[in-house]
């Protein structure tokens, strides 16, 4: 066969569906890879062909478009299993072309088994809630495209394995489920199960996604930074170690870029001559708040490394904060015989 | 089938406290949570707050935290609404809802509480 | 807070003819999941409020289709397309986007 633009295997788009539910699967050429979309291509004379290779299996292979009750089906760019069976498993090729074109991509479908209480390897999304912030709402995800807005599904959310009926401050409204307030207590797996009819059949779509509860902006505040302060000298002699904890607390901030650097002498460790490590960890509240420490380290300070200047620095979408260490050079303890004995008039 | 039944009228003085009831049958009492809501004479609705009848947490709206109280007897089925300090405003009638989707769609028949030297 | 403004009274209206109730909300009620977060409420003399529509033109359960609602965001129409006598109250509009729910003042439905 002639030529064809292979995008090759897109893993990043790899689909999972849960096994005997309907699923659609839109070709990702015109989505990712084509700058047109396929109505353009269709009325250009171009057709869209699938075909699949079995999981193991190195052979491609047509798709059957002929199996009972057309349970395979393709309309438009869109590939229809109604519904899906654990042995679909594969990577799948859409091939657009025509004589003198052609562009194909392959992507991986795993059809995943779910027990009773919605557990399965399918990974799911996480949606943040922020804690005690009034009304918040999730949605029903992916469920468009699957029946008319003329059909009426009937939608059941679970919290893990139980039905919410009403769990007080969660409330189902349909395709969403309403959060009056959330609370920690609200963290964990929601599913929705949509049931809708179609041709005289009942399918069903289960979706699950992760609820976590944040810590709200209206509690946020800038980096505060724990250490250094001004409570803590670092006094060291030349020789010895110095190692000087910067410790900040962010507030969860959606989206925010938390950052913590060291100076010296207003240089970032990098650009200066001095022997420095610098190890950061990282620990996270309940509701996502965040502390760092990056511990500034020099094996063996030296009498002008204790006269440099050693600035935390720390910022987030709600601010910049630093703060300076001090640090000083320890004066010797006095040795008795000379330095005492002259301080009584010892001759 | 689901129905609130609150407590009678009261007619209060100034400074005393009142404590209204709202009792529910027809449902299990700790799946939904219940809200109040505020109809001073020849007025409009404004909604009070709320109470998470599972755990008893209250949440009030701004304009009735200090002097307004929510709680539960949940062996009873029953809210309350406990207002301290009556002043001459309180008067009004007030009625329990219970929170579930569509909202609002079970009310009490209200309480009308007077404030009057 | 959402405020939600109603005129005190209707234009008077004679039975069998057709109604409508105007409320306007300060804040968009379009919620980013597609729905609209305003809800009409009647209060009949003498009774409790009693739910009518919900997310903006669903009908309550119970509730006659001689009762429909629509709107924008912001601008919101309750219809009522032949008023019978037993439609006399006062409409209330609300919003549950957010919290506090908060409630218009109320419109009084007059009959000439």
């Known amino acids: 066969s002639e030529r064809c633009d292979d995008w090759g295997l897109d893993t990043m788009r790899q689909i999972q569906v849960f096994e005997d539910e309907p699923a659609r699967i839109k070709c990702p050429l015109f989505e990712h890879f084509l700058k047109f979309n396929y109505s353009t291509a269709h009325s250009a004379g171009l057709t869209l062909i699938w075909y699949w290779t079995r999981q193991d299996r190195d052979l491609e292979e047509p798709i059957n478009f002929r199996l009972p009750e057309n349970r395979i089906s393709k309309e438009k760019d869109v590939l229809w299993f109604r519904p899906t069976l654990l042995n679909d498993t594969g990577n799948y090729t859409c091939m657009l072309r025509n004589t003198t074109y052609c562009s194909k991509v392959a992507f991986p479908l795993e059809v995943v088994q779910k027990d009773s209480c919605f557990n399965s390897p399918m990974k799911l999304p996480v949606h943040k809630l922020y804690i005690e912030y009034g009304i918040q709402r999730i949605t029903c995800p992916n469920v468009d495209g699957y029946f008319p807005s003329s059909v009426k599904p009937t939608i059941t959310w679970y919290m893990g394995c139980y039905k919410i009926q009403n769990f007080n401050n969660v409330i189902p409204e349909g395709m969403n489920l309403s959060f009056l307030i959330a609370l920690i207590s609200n963290n964990g797996n929601y599913t929705c199960v949509v049931t809708y009819p179609e041709n005289g059949r009942t399918f069903h779509l289960t979706r699950t996604l992760t609820v976590k509860v944040v810590g709200s902006p209206k509690n946020a505040v800038p980096p505060v930074i724990h250490s250094p302060n001004d409570h803590v000298v670092y006094e060291k002699e030349p020789g010895e170690e110095l190692l000087i904890p910067c410790t900040v607390y962010f507030s969860f901030l959606m989206d925010s870029r938390n950052e913590v650097w060291w100076t010296i002498d207003g240089k970032k460790p990098d650009d200066i001559t001095i022997d420095v490590t610098i190890n950061e960890s990282i620990s996270h509240s309940r509701t996502e708040d965040e502390t760092r420490t990056q511990i500034l380290s020099i094996k063996k300070v030296t009498s002008e490394d204790l006269k440099r200047s050693y600035v935390c620095h720390a910022r987030s979408a709600k601010g910049e904060v630093a703060k300076a260490a001090k640090v000083k050079q320890k004066v010797p303890a006095p040795r008795y015989t000379v330095e005492l004995a002259c301080g009584f008039g010892a001759t | 089938q689901i129905q609130l039944v609150q407590s009678g009228p009261e007619l209060k003085k100034p400074g005393e406290t009142v404590k209204i009831s709202c009792k529910a049958s027809?449902?299990?009492?700790?799946?939904?949570?219940m809200h109040w809501v505020k109809q001073a004479p020849e007025k409009g609705l404004k909604w009070m707050g709320w109470?998470?009848?599972?755990?008893?947490?209250?949440t009030y709206a701004d304009d009735f935290k200090g002097r307004f109280a929510f709680s539960l007897e949940t062996s009873a089925s029953t809210a309350y609404l406990q207002i301290n300090n009556l002043k001459n405003e309180d008067t009004a009638t007030y009625f329990c809802?219970?929170?579930?989707?569509?909202?609002?769609?079970?009310w009490g028949q209200g309480t009308l509480v007077t404030v009057s030297a | 807070d959402i405020v939600m403004t109603q005129a005190a009274f209707s234009n008077p209206v004679t039975l069998g003819t057709s109604a409508s109730i105007s409320c306007r909300s300060s804040k968009s009620l379009l919620h980013s999941n597609g729905i609209t977060y305003l809800y009409w409420y009647l209060q009949k003399p003498g009774q409790s409020p009693q739910l009518l529509i919900y997310?903006?033109?669903n009908l309550a359960s119970g509730v006659p289709d001689r009762f429909s609602s629509s709107g924008s965001g912001t601008d919101f129409t309750l219809r009522i397309s032949r008023v019978e006598a037993e439609d006399v109250g006062v409409y209330y509009c609300?919003?549950?986007?957010?919290?506090?729910?908060?409630f218009g003042s109320g419109t009084k439905l007059e009959i000439k």
């Open positions: 109470i998470n009848t599972e755990t008893g947490e209250p």
């Open positions: 997310q903006m033109s």
């Open positions: 809802a219970r929170g579930s989707f569509p909202w609002f769609t079970y």
């Open positions: 609300a919003q549950n986007l957010e919290l506090p729910f908060t």
């Open positions: 027809g449902y299990t009492f700790t799946d939904y949570s």
